[in-house]
């Protein structure tokens, strides 16, 4: 059974993941329309369902494409460091949260970068609210 300390640690990690995803989404939405419309040409893969921590494997698999798109959009922009930091944070947090169990992602739809970040934000929020109730 999970101890209160491990539950607390998971909660903190989910809070951190949520924060980093929100930082990325804010960055995307802050781009002037000229950049955003071009970013929307890229597609990201979402699994059939995201309800458990092990499903974070599917987020991990999309982090490299996500970083590439954000870097392409930024070009020589000074925000590049923030993106790399957020992606790195997400990578570390996801590795801690998803556990060692191997999970095969079944992707069933492609979405834009905005939808992708919003869906994973919603996932974090739902897990956080479920574990705090």
């Amino acid at each position: 059974a999970p101890t209160s300390s491990s539950t607390k640690e998971t909660q903190e990690q989910l809070d951190q993941l949520l924060l980093d995803l929100q930082v990325l989404l804010k960055g995307v939405n802050d781009y002037k329309n000229s950049k955003l419309s071009r970013m929307l040409t890229f597609k990201f893969y979402m699994p059939k369902k995201v309800t458990e921590l092990k499903h974070l494997q599917c987020l991990e698999e999309e982090l490299k494409p996500l970083e590439e798109v954000l870097n392409l959009a930024q070009g020589k922009n000074s925000h590049g460091g923030n993106t790399r930091e957020s992606i790195s944070n997400i990578n570390v947090t996801v590795l801690k949260l998803k556990g060692s169990e191997t999970f095969m992602c079944e992707y069933d739809e492609t979405v834009t970068i905005v939808e992708f970040l919003n869906r994973w934000i919603t996932f974090c929020q739902s897990i956080i609210s479920a574990s705090s109730s």
Partner: antibody
Framework: EVQLVQSGTEVKKAGDSLKISCKGS????????IGWVRQMPGRGLEWMGT????????RYSPSFQGQVTMSADKSISTAYLQWGSLRASDTAMYYC??????????WGQGTMVTVSS | SYELTQPPSVSVSPGQTARITCSGD??????AYWYQQKSGQAPVLVIY???KRPSGIPERFSGSSSGTTVTLTISDVQAEDDADYYC??????????FGAGTKLTVLG
């Protein structure tokens, strides 16, 4: 109603200069890319490039770089495509189109340009 | 330079289903868009982001994607669907490109 209205048919001689226009209405012209597309007689669509009217950021297809110039005057919601020296091979229909959510959702009616040698 | 490959022509009888494919190396990571162009008219967007249909486009038009190939499907084909169909996408460096186009002929 959201629309793009293009200037009329042009008949020119090789070596002439030309500037055709595309006027947007019914939406915030500044904040959407305007693309230009060429269609030679009996042929397919070719993407020439695109301009963002708010700051005139411009991207050209490698095939058209240096051959044409794209510009925009956001004060009158109009984008332009111009040639310094026309060739017979520039004979084509030219379309402007609005780029929204990464697709060209609104198209002008086209401007036919005929260049005689 | 980046290319999108389409069949030159597809022929179907009214009421049948037409499928037009478009292949390109970047399509696993870049959305595709489909345009219909009837003779003497400007192109019209019929599918965007692989599968989405703009308002005003009949439900008979649908899009799908698998790996490096996207497909435009027109079910219960009507005489008015007789047109050229172009796929469009962007390469990895964000330069846009159209396929060469597919002429859909509705027989009869």
């Amino acid at each position: 109603e959201v629309q793009l209205v293009q200037s009329g048919t042009e008949v020119k001689k090789a070596g002439d200069s030309l500037k055709i226009s595309c006027k947007g209405s019914g939406y915030n012209f500044d904040t959407y890319w305007i693309g230009w597309v060429r269609q030679m007689p009996g042929r397919g669509l070719e993407w020439m490039g695109t301009i963002y009217p708010a700051d005139s950021d411009t991207r050209y297809s490698p095939s058209f770089q240096g051959q044409v110039t794209m510009s925009a005057d956001k004060s009158i919601s109009t984008a332009y495509l111009q040639w310094g020296s026309l060739r017979a091979s520039d004979t084509a229909m030219y379309y402007c189109a609005r780029f929204s959510s990464s697709a060209y959702d609104i198209w002008g009616q086209g401007t036919m340009v005929t260049v005689s040698s | 330079s980046y290319e999108l490959t389409q069949p030159p022509s597809v022929s179907v009888s009214p009421g049948q289903t037409a499928r037009i494919t478009c292949s390109g190396d970047a399509l696993p990571r870049k959305f595709a868009y489909w345009y219909q162009q009837k003779s003497g008219q400007a192109p019209v967007l019929v599918i965007y982001q692989d599968t989405k249909r703009p308002s005003g486009i009949p439900e008979r038009f649908s899009g799908s994607s698998s790996g490096t190939t996207v497909t435009l499907t027109i079910s219960d084909v009507q005489a008015e669907d007789d047109a050229d169909y172009y796929c469009q996408s962007a390469d990895r460096s964000d330069s846009y490109v159209f396929g060469a186009g597919t002429k859909l002929t509705v027989l009869g």
